[in-house]
């Protein structure tokens, strides 16, 4: 009985009344695979869902959003309202992005302007609330009598090698911790014992936490109500 | 079968008032999220008013203030009253469940009114 139903193509479903006769899926239902025992209800594109596909006995109907809406999810699961570029959708509706952020999409959330500061370029055109802000070249660069053409690196002087300049440091060093070292040890001729163990363990002690510090952090941010910008 | 049933629309004079009803049945209205959207002539739908099963209430800016949406549970029926109304309030307007409990965003398993009609004009 089982080899009569798997040979039931996709748009049929296998008819346990009739026999396990193949039978064509009713209207508005659809099998997408062959020997199902039954057809799945297609979907309906309705209210903010318009069809984009319409459904068939082999396929399910495909839905988009209608105007003013964008789909989320897999499949068009959702549609969410629109909002104007420069605006982002909070609970309580479209709102302006706030100082310093921007959208220039209809959807999506205010993203705060690049920061051009951070990889040493300058601003060269202003953000808005619907266009992040152009960075330009470096404020060096801009620079009274600098030349746009990329200088050549300075010549480096004879004598003056990495391997020598880290060798110097490394030997001051160490002659640095041998005088630290000789230092203390006369100090235990005038010291006690006892007095000297104290030193060497002084900076490594961790200070008593107060109450307030092992709370972690004391100070609390207010709660920010949503779509509100900060001054 | 879900079925959402409006009623209520009609023609009012601008500052006047309406109550506009949604009769719910097919599903467990007294645990859904419900809501009110709208359609003006040749515009696009707009998310208009929401309420959560447990009573808390959104609305979009345009119509804080003056439309208030509540619902009985004991009677499956939705309701918004809309008072101080405006010739921008002329729409369509349909209930539908609210299944995303998201400001402007319903799913593919929401179910939708056919809609009454509110005409605000002198």
């Known amino acids: 009985l089982q080899d009569l139903c798997s040979n039931c193509p996709a748009g049929t479903f296998c008819d346990n009344n009739r026999s396990q006769i193949c039978s064509p899926c009713p209207p508005n239902s659809f099998s997408s695979a062959g020997g199902q025992r039954t057809c799945d209800i297609c979907r309906q594109c309705k209210g903010v869902f318009k069809t984009r596909k319409e459904c068939s006995s082999t396929s399910n109907a495909e839905c988009d959003c209608i105007s003013g809406y964008h789909c989320l999810g897999a499949e068009c699961s959702m549609c969410e309202q629109d909002c104007k570029q420069g605006q982002e959708l909070t609970k309580k509706g479209c709102k302006d992005c706030c100082f310093g952020t921007f959208n220039d999409q209809k959807r999506g959330i205010c993203r705060p302007w690049t920061n051009c500061s951070l990889d040493g370029k300058s601003v060269l055109v202003n953000g808005t609330k619907e266009r992040d802000v152009v960075c330009g070249p470096s404020p060096a660069d801009l620079s009274p009598g600098a030349s746009s053409a990329t200088p050549p690196a300075p010549a480096r002087e004879p004598g003056h090698s990495p391997q020598i300049i880290f060798f110097l440091a490394l030997t001051s060093t160490v002659v640095l911790f041998l005088l630290f070292f000789l230092v203390l040890r006369f100090s235990v001729v005038k010291r006690s014992r006892k007095k000297l163990l104290y030193i060497f363990k002084q900076p490594f002690m961790r200070p008593v936490q107060t109450t307030q510090e092992e709370d972690g952090c004391s100070c609390r941010f207010p709660e920010e109500e949503e779509g509100g910008c900060e001054l | 079968e879900v079925q959402l049933v409006e009623s209520g629309g009609g023609l009012v004079q601008p500052g006047g008032s309406l109550r506009l009803s949604c009769a719910a049945s097919?599903?467990?209205?007294?645990?859904?999220?419900m809501s009110w959207a709208r359609q003006a002539p040749g515009k696009g739908l707009e998310w208009v008013s929401g309420i959560y099963s447990g009573g808390s209430t959104y609305y979009t800016e345009s119509v804080k203030d003056r439309f208030t949406i509540s619902r009985d549970n004991a009677k499956n029926t939705l309701y918004l009253q809309m008072n101080s109304l405006r010739p921008e309030d002329t729409a369509v307007y349909y209930c539908a469940t609210w299944g995303t409990l998201r400001f402007g965003v319903w799913a593919e398993y929401d179910h939708w009114g056919q809609g009454t009609l509110v005409t605000v004009s002198s």
């Open positions: 097919g599903f467990t209205f007294s645990s859904s999220a």
